[in-house]
Structure formats: C-alpha cells, structure tokens
Interface confidence: medium
C-alpha cells in the first residue's frame, strides 16, 4: 500500500482513503463538532484566587465539560459500532472478491484501523481522566465559593443589622441631646432669673445690714447706759439689804438664816417652793461662786437644771475650752452651762441626765439615762452614763464607754482628725461618734445631709440636723 | 492605744478561700465601721468592702460582690473577711482600716491601719 | 467608679527643698456640705497606709504642717513645703465621696 491519506468531505465526516496498486479504499467515520482536539487542551487556572468566581460561569463551564464528556463517549461508542459493521462488511466482499494477496492487505489495513481505533479511545481515555480531574476540582471549588458566599452574606447582614442599630441609637441620642440643649437652655434662662433675683436680695439684705448696723451702733449705747443704770440700781438694791439685815436681825433671827441659804441645782430651788420656770442663781458645791441656770419647774415632775440648750441659732457654739468648762451663752435662751459646774454638781451625789430633741416636722424624743456624771478637767470632762430609757433611740447615741470632751483647741477624741474642728462644736466626740448636739445649727430645708449639724444618730440618722435640742440634768432620788 | 491586729500570712491553693481576721483594741469597736483594702504586688490600694461593727450592715465592691464576706464578732472586737474563689491574681496584701464617719458607714477617712496580711495564690 | 488620676509617678526630691503632687477625680468630689471628700495617704516602705490630710485640706493629728492639702471638685493637690528623708515613700489620694471608695495609681517620692 502506497498511500494512505486523510480528508474531509462536504458533510463534514472525517474520511480515510488507502489506495493499494489499482485498488483504492475509502472509509468514512462520523465527526463530532464539539470534540477538543488534543493539539488545545482545556487548561483551568493554576492558581487558587482569594475572590469566588462568578457562580453561573463556573456552572456554564460544568454543563460544556459534561456535554463535551458525554458527546465524546457517543462518538466512542458510534465508532466502535461503525468499524464494527463496516468490517463485516468489507471482509464479506473481500473474501468473496480479493484475491489472495488483497485479503493480507485488507487484514494489514484492519490492522491499522484497530490500531489506530485503540490510540483514539487511549486519547479519550485520557481526555475523560482530564475531565473527571477538572470536574472534582471545579466542584470542590464550587462548595468554597458557595461557603466563601454564605459567610459574606451572613457578614454582610450581620453589618447591616449593626448599622441599624447604631442608626437607631444616633437618632435616639440625638433626640437626647436636643431635648438636653433645650433643658440646658431653659435652666440657663432659670438661672439668669434667679441671679437676677438674687442680686435684688443681696441689695436689700445690704441695705437691711446697713440699718442694722446703725441699730447696733444705737443699741450698744442704750445698752452701756442701761449697764450703767443697772449697776447703780444694784449698789441701790444691796445697800437697802443691807439696812434691812441690820434692822431685822435683832428682832427675828430666822430671817438671816432663810437669807444666807443658797441651791446648789434646780431640784433644791424647787424643794424651797419655787415653782415657776426661769432663771436661778445656784452656788458651787463647798463653794461660794455663783452661776445663773435655767430651771425647768414644770416637765416630769420639775426640778431639771439645764445644762444645754439650741433653739434657734443664735449662739455661736463653736467655742475654746475655757469657754465650755465656764459655760457661755444666754441662760433663757441658748446656752452652755459649764462643764466645771457640772463636773462638781454630779460628783456631790447620783443625777439622771434627760436629753430632749425635736426635729422640723414637729415630732419630739427623749433618751434618758439613770446614771449621768462628768470627770473632773485632768480627766478631760470624761462622760459616763448608764440605764438607757426613751423614745430616741434604743442605742446610745453618746458612745459607751464615754469619751473625754474635745473643743477646736482641746482635741482629745478617738480620732486621727480633728472632730471639733469638722464637726463644730465642743462634745464628746469618739471618731467622731454617733452625736453631736453642739453643732452647726441649720435651719429648715437645710437641716439634712450635713455631717456637722446637731446629729443624734439613732434618733433621726447621720445627716439630719435637728430644730431644738435640751439636755437637763436632776438627782436620781428627786 | 488604739490599734488593729490582724492574723498571720496565708498560702493558698486557686480556689480556694481565705479568712482574714482584724482584732480591734483601745476604742469602741461597735462605734465604728470596719474597712477592707487591699494591694497587690506593685499595684495601687484597691477598697473591697466595709461593715458596720454596730449593727452588722455590709457593702462590697461590685467587683468582689459575690466572692467577698465580711463578718464582725463584736464579743470579740474582730471583723473577718472571707474571699472565696480564690486566684492567682487575688495574691496581694489585705488591710483592715478603720473608717471616720459621720455614722451611719459613710467614711471619709481610714484613721487606723492593720499591719496587713499577706495572702499567696499558687498551685 | 470615680477614676483617681495621680502625677508625676515619681518625684526625686532633695532634702529642704518644696514638693508637689497632682490628683485629679473624673468627677466632683464636692459634697453638698461643702467639704471635698479626698484624702491623702502615704505609705512608708514596709509600713501600712497612713492618713496625712483628710477632706481635702484638714491635716490629721500628728501630721507635720509641712503637709498641705488643697485644690476643690476635681483636681487637688499635695505639698511639702520642706522635704525631709523620713517623707519617703508613696502617696496616695482617695476619693471618699461614693462607693466603691477608689485611690490613685501612687507616688513615689525618693530622694535624689
């Protein structure tokens, strides 16, 4: 065989022409349109990319590689068919006209052709391991993408539901805001009014000061002439004693002796027959100093001295030590009798101490103890009590053991500060202890939160500053 | 003198608990409130809790709530503070102080210091 | 909480000569009764906490008046008006005015 040549007809079938001597042979076989040849093979990208493909171009590319694959396989199977009958065939007419040597060449060509049929579904083979390759490739590239897209999705609504919600709150402090500047300026303007009001009250207080000035001024005056007066009245008053003690000494001797008794507290002005509260003169024990107290004639019973008082503000009790042993203010009013007098008063004989408070809603307390004295100076005016009875409060709220008494410039409490000089006022602080009815006093819708206003805690609490407070003193076997 | 003393050092095991005691001397204990501070190494004093010796009140640290309890025995003038949980950043030293008030538990000052105790954290 | 802001961290001293220290509270320790309720603490190496001013500027008992405490609502500060070796150590403020009680980071003065 000469020759053996290969061409296309005009129906596009693929034809195998051997021409052998005089004789020629032809073979036509079908060809697929889609089949790649093998000269370009389909090459996928080498490289993994961060960003998914786009989903339907990898799907289209699936679909081609599948059809390609399937179509491959017809043509396979059509082929085999082809060569099959057309064998038959050819081997029929051969053997029934070749000759001898025609018949080698025919088996030479069948040869050829099984040859060439077995490279060709080699080839496809191959091309089908390809396809199967790429196929599990683009799948496993396909189920990244999918979860790459899943979790983008799922961020990207994640966001979105975060930039609604920050959206709402914007809008929400936004509207907080604005209503905050509209508040801001309503005080502002409430503010001003209140400045404005204020200064007018600062100019009449001003002026009212003035005048009061003058009427000090005035009154200090009248007040040195009165002392004046006072003074001659009392020269007056202890010469006419005087003539009468002479006079009368001689005809009644009970006088003098009624004359030279003097009281040591309330409770014996009270034996005596006085029975009208008010302000006496009581002497020192073994002593004849003298010292003005109040005596209360009237509540249980009578007989009280009283030894503190507040009622209004207008005694400063934020004093020295000397001041407190000596006692200070005004007896009918508010006042401190002294801590000298009391200290020797409760040493002479057993006294009960009764502390009466009222607060500003009008509600009134008492804690009364049964046994009550103070220690002398060195021992700092000390405090002792015992037998707690009363409505204010089940404890003391004078801390037991008592403590010594400590003023601004006597500080002897329990305190690495300076109680007296925190709180105000001369007490028996601890650190600085649950009462203090020496201090700040403080009017009205002014009286609470103030750690150093006139505090007894286990009536009315830590901050509560009360409206009057009295604390009297009178013997246990009254 | 007033003074407070406070139980020896104590090595414990991550959660575990510990119990502090502060014996209190030469002052009213029942008048006042008890403190609870505490230091860790090279950091700054950190406030735990304090406890009103009187009536027995408490108020804790919102960050050791739940974890911290303080108790007081007042026959025997002593507070205790119990931190249970315990971890290695609980190694610190414990201080009790004593509180100035204006009665009623609101301090405004620590007067009086224990000597501290220090507590170790290790497994 | 209340945030205590202490500077410096550290402060060299030289004997005889004036320090100060800076506490700063992220809010008013300004309390309606008019006292400010910050103190100071120093803490001496081994040694426990000890109250030097309290309220802002009232020096506890004992405390040398070399130590002054000032300042009002948010920002205080401390002074030694003549450092002397036994003032080394490191000072803490506090802020007393709510709960949980808070201190500053501290200060350490060491002579130079």
């Known amino acids: 065989y000469n020759n053996f040549r290969k061409s296309m007809d005009s129906i596009g079938k693929k034809q195998y022409q051997v021409q052998h001597g005089s004789c020629s042979y032809t073979f036509l076989l079908p060809e697929m349109d889609n089949c790649r040849s093998s000269s370009s093979p389909y090459v996928s990208n080498a490289v993994q990319r961060d960003a998914p493909l786009e989903y339907d171009d990898s799907v289209q590319r699936l679909q081609v590689l599948e059809n390609i694959m399937e179509n491959n396989t017809q043509w396979l199977m059509k082929l085999e068919n082809y060569i099959q009958d057309n064998m038959k065939k050819e081997m029929v007419e051969i053997q029934q006209n070749a000759v001898q040597n025609q018949t080698a060449v025919m088996i030479e060509i069948g040869t050829n052709l099984l040859n060439q049929t077995a490279e060709q579904t080699r080839k496809l083979t191959d091309v089908e391991a390809q396809v199967l390759n790429q196929t599990t490739r683009l799948e496993l590239q396909l189920l990244e993408h999918s979860l790459s897209t899943n979790k983008l999705e799922k961020q990207i609504l994640d966001q979105t539901s975060e930039i609604n919600k920050l959206q709402d709150k914007n809008s929400f402090l936004e509207k907080k805001v604005l209503a905050m500047e509209d508040k801001h300026i309503i005080q502002l303007q409430s503010i001003k009014e209140e400045k404005d009001q204020l200064q007018v009250l600062v100019s009449k207080q001003n002026s009212i000061i003035e005048e009061l000035e003058k009427k000090i001024v005035t009154a200090t005056v009248n007040n040195s002439v009165l002392q004046k007066q006072q003074h001659d009245l009392m020269e007056t008053v202890n010469n006419l004693l005087t003539m009468m003690s002479t006079s009368n000494s001689a005809k009644d001797p009970t006088v003098a002796k009624e004359e030279q008794i003097s009281f040591r507290d309330c409770a014996e002005v009270f034996k005596s027959g006085h029975t009208t509260n008010g302000i006496y003169t009581l002497t020192f024990p073994n002593s004849t100093e003298e010292i003005k107290a109040y005596c209360d004639m009237e509540a249980g019973g009578g007989g009280w001295t009283i030894i503190q008082r507040r009622e209004d503000g207008s005694v400063d009790f934020q004093r020295t030590w000397k001041e407190y042993k000596v006692g200070f203010g005004n007896p009918s009013g508010e006042y401190w009798l002294g801590n000298e007098f009391v200290s020797q008063l409760t040493n002479q004989q057993r006294y009960v101490l009764k502390i009466h408070l009222k607060d500003w809603e009008g509600n009134e307390a008492y804690s009364l103890y049964e046994h009550f004295y103070l220690s002398s100076e060195e021992l700092n005016y000390r405090i002792h009590l015992k037998g707690l009875t009363g409505t204010a409060g089940k404890i003391s709220s004078i801390s037991q053991p008592g403590n010594d008494f400590s003023t601004k410039d006597g500080d002897n409490d329990k305190c690495i500060c300076k109680c007296s000089q925190m709180l105000t006022g001369g007490w028996w602080f601890d650190a600085c202890g649950p009462s203090n009815l020496n201090g700040m006093y403080y009017p009205q819708r002014q009286n609470t939160n103030k750690f150093n206003g006139i505090k007894w805690y286990y009536w009315k609490g830590s901050g509560y500053s009360l409206k009057a407070t009295t604390m009297m003193i009178r013997p246990a076997d009254f | 003198q007033v003074q407070l003393v406070q139980s020896g050092a104590e090595v414990k095991k991550p959660g575990a608990s510990v119990k502090v005691s502060c014996k209190a001397s030469?002052?009213?204990?029942?008048?006042?409130?008890m403190h609870w501070v505490r230091q860790a190494p090279g950091q700054r004093l950190e406030w735990m809790g304090w406890i009103n010796a009187g009536n027995g009140n408490t108020k804790y640290s919102q960050k050791f709530q739940g974890r911290v309890t303080i108790t007081r025995d007042t026959s025997a003038s002593t507070a205790y503070m119990e931190l249970s949980g315990l971890r290695s950043e609980d190694t610190a030293v414990y201080y009790c102080?004593?509180?100035?008030?204006?009665?009623?538990?609101?301090?405004?000052?620590?007067?009086?210091w224990g000597q501290g105790t220090m507590v170790t954290v290790s497994s | 909480d209340i945030v205590m802001t202490q500077s410096p961290l550290s402060l060299p001293v030289t004997p005889g000569e004036p320090a100060s220290i800076s506490c700063r509270s992220s809010q008013s320790l300004l309390h309606s009764n008019g006292y400010n309720y910050l103190d100071w603490y120093l803490q001496k190496p081994g040694q426990s906490p000890q109250l030097l001013i309290y309220?802002?500027?009232n020096r506890a008992s004992g405390v040398p008046d070399r130590f002054t405490g000032s300042g009002s609502a948010t920002d205080f500060t401390l002074r030694i008006s003549r450092v002397e070796a036994e003032d080394v150590g490191v000072y803490y403020c506090?802020?007393?005015?709510?709960?949980?009680?808070?201190f500053g980071g501290g200060t350490k003065v060491e002579i130079k």
């Open positions: 309220l802002g500027s």
């Open positions: 102080a004593r509180g100035v008030d204006d009665y009623g538990g609101n301090s405004w000052a620590f007067d009086i």
């Open positions: 030469g002052y009213t204990f029942t008048s006042y409130a």
């Open positions: 506090m802020q007393a005015l709510q709960t949980p009680l808070t």
